[in-house]
Interface confidence: medium
């Protein structure tokens, strides 16, 4: 093993090129200067190094930069990024969006790996907030990214970034996340006219309070059932039959198919049967005529 530590005569690498793929692992270790590797990282990605050879190259960089790689190296890691552990990445200081994009490209088309999650976390923390360009980039690579954040993390998203969000980016968000995002969206889209505003805000309505749903019902928005079914139950319950009818417009007929599912089921239980009958949909389960409706939540609030 001792003689393997010295680079064989004539094998010292003067540049990173295809000839190195024929080097054994120990030869790479002995014959490739780490500083040369760092300055020519952009070439590594074009050369078909094997998995084992990539391990050697990573080891050389680790020795050269024990405190973490500089961004000039990180940006050109390419497939070598896949050899990095979250612990390696936590040592990095990534500030350039171009660097982030270059590394996300390597992982493109696949689920978010622990490496990528750590990289994004480092990047966002370094920036202090999820600005629009960053959010644009992250949701382009990972449509579900936004919904992977905690409500606390989402609170750092500035309203201006909401413009980058597409409906599919919110598909997996839960009500707690939409509660945080909705006020930001409302603020971001506040200067739009009625119909354009509804198109933009629609995906965020799972976080909307009752008063906003009431306001929307006055604007002939024709909300579809899929959106209605994602509304907060507590926001839907206080709506009157007339308000729901206006909110849904021609889509009101879809209530019948959803009468056993929340929030429709719970809303039906809160309406007078007489009022439900005016819809002509055969919805059953409302409060029979002559019964007094006590709003216990209101009563508790008053006491």
């Amino acid at each position: 093993e001792v003689e393997k530590t010295a680079c064989p005569s004539g094998k010292k690498a003067r540049e990173i090129d295809e000839s190195l793929i024929f080097y054994k692992k120990w030869e790479l270790e002995a014959c490739v200067d780490a500083a040369l590797l760092a300055t020519q990282m952009d070439r590594v990605n074009a050369i078909p190094f094997t998995y084992e050879q990539l391990d050697v190259l990573k080891h050389k960089l680790d020795e050269l930069y024990p405190q973490g790689y500089p961004e000039s190296v990180i940006q050109h890691l390419g497939y070598l990024f896949l050899k990095m552990s979250p612990e390696d990445i936590r040592k990095w200081n990534v500030t350039s969006l171009e660097t982030l994009k270059a590394l996300l490209e390597v992982n493109k088309g696949h689920e978010m790996s622990p490496q990528v999650a750590t990289l994004i976390d480092r990047f966002v923390k370094g920036r202090g907030q999820l600005d629009k360009d960053t959010l644009d980039t992250l949701t382009a690579f990972y449509p579900g990214y936004l919904c992977s954040l905690s409500p606390e993390e989402l609170s750092s998203v500035p309203p201006s970034s909401i413009w980058a969000v597409r409906p599919q980016d919110l598909d997996t968000c839960d009500p707690r996340q939409l509660d945080v995002l909705y006020p930001k969206a409302r603020l971001a889209f506040q200067n739009m006219n009625g119909s354009e505003y509804f198109v933009k805000i629609q995906s965020f309505l799972g976080g909307a309070p009752t008063e906003d749903l009431k306001a929307l019902s006055q604007q002939n928005v024709s909300m579809d059932l899929a959106t209605f079914m994602k509304l907060r139950t507590d926001a839907v319950l206080p709506l009157t039959v007339a308000e729901v009818q206006k909110l849904l417009g021609p889509h009101v007929e879809g209530l019948k198919a959803e009468e056993r599912h929340r929030p429709v089921r719970d809303w039906i239980l809160r309406q007078r049967q007489d009022d439900l009958d005016t819809l002509g949909l055969g919805l059953q389960g409302g409060i029979p005529n002559g019964y007094l409706v006590l709003d216990l939540s209101m009563q508790e609030a008053l006491s």
């Epitope: 295809e18 793929i21 692992k25 998995y51 497939y79 896949l82 390597v106 992982n107």
Partner: antibody
């Protein structure tokens, strides 16, 4: 259907030249590393050369370096092997092979699609 | 170059029997790949990354091993399994193939 079809083989004298072609279909040719692998009569398989998607990286087995040239035309979905200074030991069936697209897109270590092969005979 | 030695060179078995094919590398490799070649046909990928079945390959085929010793097993031979089998490595350049094991009907 994913398919590779080789052509251009034949009988050639020692020192002569031949150009093999491989027509690819049924997949996005421009995304894959491609290789040539040969099989001498009654013998095993031997990797000859490979080329990356944009032709910026080319590798040869030492015994053919300087004599063979691999190239590709992504617009035509075609792979080529120009063989010069042919020797008797180059006699073989030449296969065009696709290098598998692995998880994360990194080039893998195997050939996942093979052509039917074209026969090259070097003899006087 | 990494030399791959396959054994046995020829294996004579009957349909329904279990076949065990061996491949030994001259130095340690991370993964082994297996290809099947029938007479006058091109090779076909069977196993990748040591133990993963390629698309469309029957589950009677399996691969195992690590370091320098790898095995291809066919649990119950079917008539169409009689062919030549090659192991292949790409842990270092150039990629190399074993000399092949011919599986013939007894």
């Amino acid at each position: 259907e994913v398919q590779l079809v080789e052509s251009g083989g034949g009988l050639v004298q020692p020192g002569g030249s031949l150009k093999l072609s491989c027509a690819a279909s049924g997949f996005d040719f421009s995304r894959y590393w491609m290789s040539w692998v040969r099989q001498a009569p009654g013998k095993g398989l031997e990797w000859v050369s490979e080329i990356n998607p944009d032709s910026s990286t080319i590798v040869y087995t030492p015994s053919v370096k300087g004599r063979f040239t691999i190239s590709r035309d992504n617009a035509k979905n075609s792979l080529y092997l120009q063989m010069n200074s042919l020797r008797a030991e180059d006699t073989a069936v030449y296969y065009c092979a696709r290098r598998g697209s692995h998880y994360y897109g990194y080039r893998t270590g195997y050939f996942d699609v093979w052509g039917a092969g074209t026969t090259v005979t070097v003899s006087s | 170059d990494v030399v791959l030695t396959q054994s046995p060179a020829t294996l004579s078995l009957s349909p329904g029997e279990r076949a065990t094919l061996s491949c030994r590398a001259s130095s340690s490799v991370s993964y082994m790949y297996w290809h099947q070649q029938k007479p006058d046909q091109s090779p076909k990928l069977l196993i990748y990354d040591t133990s993963n079945l390629a698309s469309g390959v029957p589950v009677r085929f399996s691969g195992s091993g690590s370091g320098t010793d790898y095995t291809l097993t066919i649990s119950s031979l079917e008539p169409e399994d009689f062919a030549v089998y090659y192991c292949q490595q790409w842990s270092s350049y150039p990629p190399t193939f074993g000399g092949g094991t011919k599986l013939e009907i007894k």
